[in-house]
Amino acid sequence: MKVLQEPTCVSDYMSISTCEWKMNGPTNCSTELRLLYQLVFLLSEAHTCIPENNGGAGCVCHLLMDDVVSADNYTLDLWAGQQLLWKGSFKPSEHVKPRAPGNLTVHTNVSDTLLLTWSNPYPPDNYLYNHLTYAVNIWSENDPADFRIYNVTYLEPSLRIAASTLKSGISYRARVRAWAQCYNTTWSEWSPSTKWHNSYREPFEQH
């Protein structure tokens, strides 16, 4: 039994780090493998993560890390029974994938403006709370070419757009994701999408 693709890990910088790797053949990850992780501190104990299958030869492990700070380093040991398959290290603060924003809502009752709001996925005392910026994706269910991205580079989790920038009388969907540019995080997953029917008054044309 060998590791084909070494574990790569990302932290949600809140409570969970996720490690994924591939074995050289079909593997029952939960029965055959264990991933041990340990904070590089005196007296710290190793914690055990039981991996799950992620495709035939792929494994994924969700490491509970409820006490992590920016300077922390962890050792990672991947075991198959008594055999050490791989040894590595992981600094959560250098491999951050933010949580997806939540509660995306489209407010259509503000004259001819669409107001999209969502929630920051972190509590105010979290390091990422004041550092997230967002991308909002809006697309038409009827026309695959009608697909747009709005970059929200300010901290407020909201976006205003004129309803008239979208076609009237058809349904649209929106979703939002987050990243923290200054800490070189990856993008979060997209939030669940929300749907609305876009309608607005066409401006009266005078001839």
Epitope: Y13, M14, L39, F41, L42, L43, S44, E45, D66, D67, V68, V69, S70, A71, S93, E94, D125, N126, Y127, L128, N130, H131, C182, Y183, N184
Partner: antibody, heavy 121, light 107 residues
Framework: QVQLVETGGGLVRPGNSLKLSCVTS????????MHWLRQPPGKRLEWIAV??????????NYAESVKGRFAISRDDSKSSVYLEMNRLREEDTATYFC????????????WGQGTTLTVSS | DIQMTQSPSSLSASLGERVSLTCRAS??????LSWLQQKPDGTIKRLIY???TLDSGVPKRFSGSRSGSDYSLTISSLESEDFADYYC?????????FGGGTKLEIK
């Protein structure tokens, strides 16, 4: 409101031992890592030790200058953190401060007023 | 260890003046930097964390910024209570390390 109060400083001879205490209030102590820092007279601040929370088995980390001589410990039931100092040297003379750090947060938002240790023969 | 080089080591300035202090990190610290104020009586207060985020209750005349490995604290208009010692702190790697401090004195 958040308070941290250090006690236990004093005058000791080189080679002797002393234990400092930091009693806290106004926050959920068990959720925070706790640190000791010090400042020798007229010099910069220096970080010396940290202790983690229960889920990390109260693991500790130390500056090289105190490793093997100082030991940090905590008592969550008393919302207190301690610094046991052995084989003290004259260069350990400083004002000692405690501070706190939240997981996934930013350290040292509150500080104690400090307690002064003088190591001299 | 990461060295934090702070400048200037001392600064004389007048009330209402704008001043800037700088810290340079010897290695990448990814914005994990705070600015602390120490009053003459020894009390320490955090002003800025994450390089640029102002602590609650800190006057808006204080601001923090980053340019590569250089980090700055700016006081836009000095007031009498601002005359104190200032330290930068990196907390991106153990051991956490401080700059040498800047003594801000009244001119």
């Amino acid at each position: 409101q958040v308070q941290l109060v250090e006690t236990g400083g004093g005058l000791v001879r080189p080679g002797n031992s002393l234990k400092l205490s930091c009693v806290t209030s106004g926050f959920t102590f068990s959720n925070y890592r706790m640190h000791w820092l010090r400042q020798p007279p007229g010099k910069r601040l220096e970080w010396i030790a940290v202790i983690t929370v229960k889920s990390n088995n109260y693991g500790a980390n130390y500056a090289e200058s105190v490793k093997g001589r100082f030991a940090i410990s905590r008592d969550d039931s008393k919302s207190s953190v301690y610094l046991e100092m052995n084989r003290l040297r004259e260069e350990d003379t400083a004002t000692y401060f405690c501070s706190r750090e939240r997981a996934y947060g930013n350290p040292f938002d509150y500080w104690g007023q400090g307690t002064t240790l003088t190591v001299s023969s | 260890d990461i060295q934090m080089t702070q400048s200037p080591s001392s600064l004389s300035a007048s009330l209402g003046e704008r001043v800037s202090l700088t810290c340079r990190a010897s290695q990448e610290i990814s914005g994990y930097l705070s600015w602390l104020q120490q009053k003459p009586d020894g009390t320490i207060k955090r002003l800025i964390y994450a390089a640029s985020t102002l602590d609650s209750g800190v006057p808006k005349r204080f601001s923090g910024s980053r340019s590569g490995s250089d980090y700055s604290l700016t006081i836009s208009s000095l007031e009498s209570e601002d005359f104190a010692d200032y330290y930068c702190l990196q907390y991106g790697s153990y051991p956490y390390t401080f700059g040498g401090g800047t003594k801000l004195e009244i001119k």
